[in-house]
């Protein structure tokens, strides 16, 4: 990671030596590098109880580089920060903290939510569903003949899965009772039950009340972790595809 790493080359004067290795400009037998060659960063490395000076081409993780007229120095990021751009801006927080505009927080501000994978405060994503598809044909036990009452269903797609704090998806399946024109079943279509049913008098004013499918209600209640993984990816695909038009298709 850090190519130019220099320490003292051989035993010289115990304090300062000019015969330094690699990136060191000056070094001491005991403290390692004291100053670095141009463009290299000076950092202190802890070895046991002692700190040794090293010269690096870039600062290690957990440190940021500052260029001064006389020295380029690596400085440690704040305690809650894993990697930082400078002393004011963290780019990755330590476990248990969430990144919001360069700072590490215990909790995210209102209107944002904690993403436990990226350890960032991110936008809350609500569920988005398409419009309903047309109702299916009216059927009873998979048949469209030989009965008066049956059920029909319609479905819609989830365009955007919600994030952990997002609104849950509404049902994606709907079933309602329906009536069909009395129609003779073709040979081989009709079963015993079909013949019995045929004799029943038609029921006037049949209800067509839609009932959300219990299966679809369950499927919309995914656990937050499952939702969170998929949502960023799907959102990006939908938005990038639609470019300058709104991605919402909920009406």
């Amino acid at each position: 990671q850090n190519a130019s790493r220099g320490r003292r080359q051989r035993r010289m004067h115990p304090n300062v030596s000019q015969g330094c290795q690699g990136g060191c400009a000056t070094c001491s037998d005991y403290n390692g590098c004291l100053s670095c060659k141009p463009r290299l960063f000076f950092a202190l490395e802890r070895i046991g109880m002692k700190q040794i000076g090293v010269c690096l081409s870039s600062c290690p993780s957990g440190y940021y580089g500052t260029r001064y007229p006389d020295i380029n120095k690596c400085t440690k990021c704040k305690a809650d920060c894993d990697t930082c751009f400078n002393k004011n801006f963290c780019t990755k927080c330590k476990s248990g903290f969430y990144l919001h505009l360069g700072k590490c927080l215990d909790n995210c501000p209102e209107g944002l939510e904690a993403n436990n994978h990226t350890m960032e405060c991110v936008s809350i994503v609500h569920c988005e569903v398409s419009e309903w598809n047309p109702w299916s044909p009216c059927t009873k036990k998979g048949k469209t003949c030989g009965f008066k009452r049956g059920t029909e269903t319609r479905v819609r797609e989830i365009i955007q899965h919600p994030s952990a704090k997002g609104n849950l998806c509404p049902p994606t399946n709907e079933t309602r009772k329906c009536t069909v024109q009395r129609k003779k079943c073709q040979k081989g279509e009709r079963g015993k039950k079909g013949r019995e049913r045929k004799r029943k008098k038609p029921n006037k004013g049949e209800s067509k009340e839609a009932i959300p499918d219990s299966k679809s209600l369950e499927s919309s209640k995914e656990i937050p972790e499952q939702r969170e993984n998929k949502q960023q990816q799907k959102k990006r695909k939908v938005q990038d595809k639609q470019k300058s038009v709104s991605v919402s298709t909920v009406h």
Partner: antibody, heavy 117, light 107 residues
């Protein structure tokens, strides 16, 4: 160096949609933090409208939530504002801006939009 | 929404003077507050972020301070280019609201 440039029609009729584009140069919109739309009304009052973040997710000002949409085209490095059902109250100078780690905040020059019949 | 109350709404000062503009928030914004300067016909320019960090290229005559719900921007030794409008904005909870602005005029 990063630059943002707003473009779009200067005049929009009431009840129509206002559509603006922010073209970004010198930085990828998939790398930045938050790509915002902000407007300034004739009396100089500023209003944050919303953003699209680097990962394509949005946040909008609740006062505009039913009318606003911010989308993007990553191949063109542009992001867009669409404001529906405009009224004369939406007459303002519209700015796009970005919040970045390195620069923290940069604004475009702004584009004036008048809503009038 | 967090309300931002900026004061004074306007002030007149002479070149060389020191002025202070304040911004009070209806609830804590945890130092996620920025100050902007806007000259006539131009877009706002960032001066200070995280309440007290000076943005790149901004004169050290500007300084931000405060915490919780009270923040201020101090301008030492006013220069002709400092005149114009000043705004505070928070970046805490959504929506990120602005203060009403302070118009700084030459006396």
């Amino acid at each position: 160096q990063i630059q943002l440039q707003e473009s779009g029609p200067g005049l929009v009729k009431p009840s129509q949609s206002l559509s603006l584009t922010c073209s970004v140069t010198g930085y990828s919109i998939t790398s930045g933090y938050y790509w915002n739309w902000i407007r300034q009304f004739p009396g100089n009052k500023l209003e944050w409208m919303g953003y699209i973040s680097y990962d394509g997710t949005n946040n909008y000002n609740p006062s505009l939530k039913d009318r606003i949409s911010i989308t993007r085209d990553t191949s063109m490095n542009q992001f867009f504002l669409k404001l529906n059902s405009v009224t004369t109250e939406d007459t303002a100078t519209y700015y796009c801006s970005v919040l970045l780690i390195q620069y923290f905040n940069i604004w475009g020059a702004g584009t004036t939009v008048t809503v009038s019949s | 929404d967090i309300q931002m109350t900026q004061s004074p709404a306007s002030l007149s000062a002479s070149v060389g003077e020191t002025v202070t503009i304040t911004c009070r928030t209806s609830e804590s914004v945890n130092n996620f507050l920025a100050w902007f300067h806007q000259k006539q016909g131009k877009s706002p320019q960032l001066l200070v972020y995280h309440a007290k960090t000076l943005a790149d290229g901004v004169s050290s005559r500007f300084s931000g301070s405060g915490s919780g719900t009270q923040y201020s921007l101090k301008i030492n030794s006013l220069q002709p280019e400092d005149f114009g409008n000043y705004y505070c904005q928070h970046f805490w909870s959504i929506p990120w609201t602005f203060g009403g602005g302070t118009k700084l005029e030459i006396k």
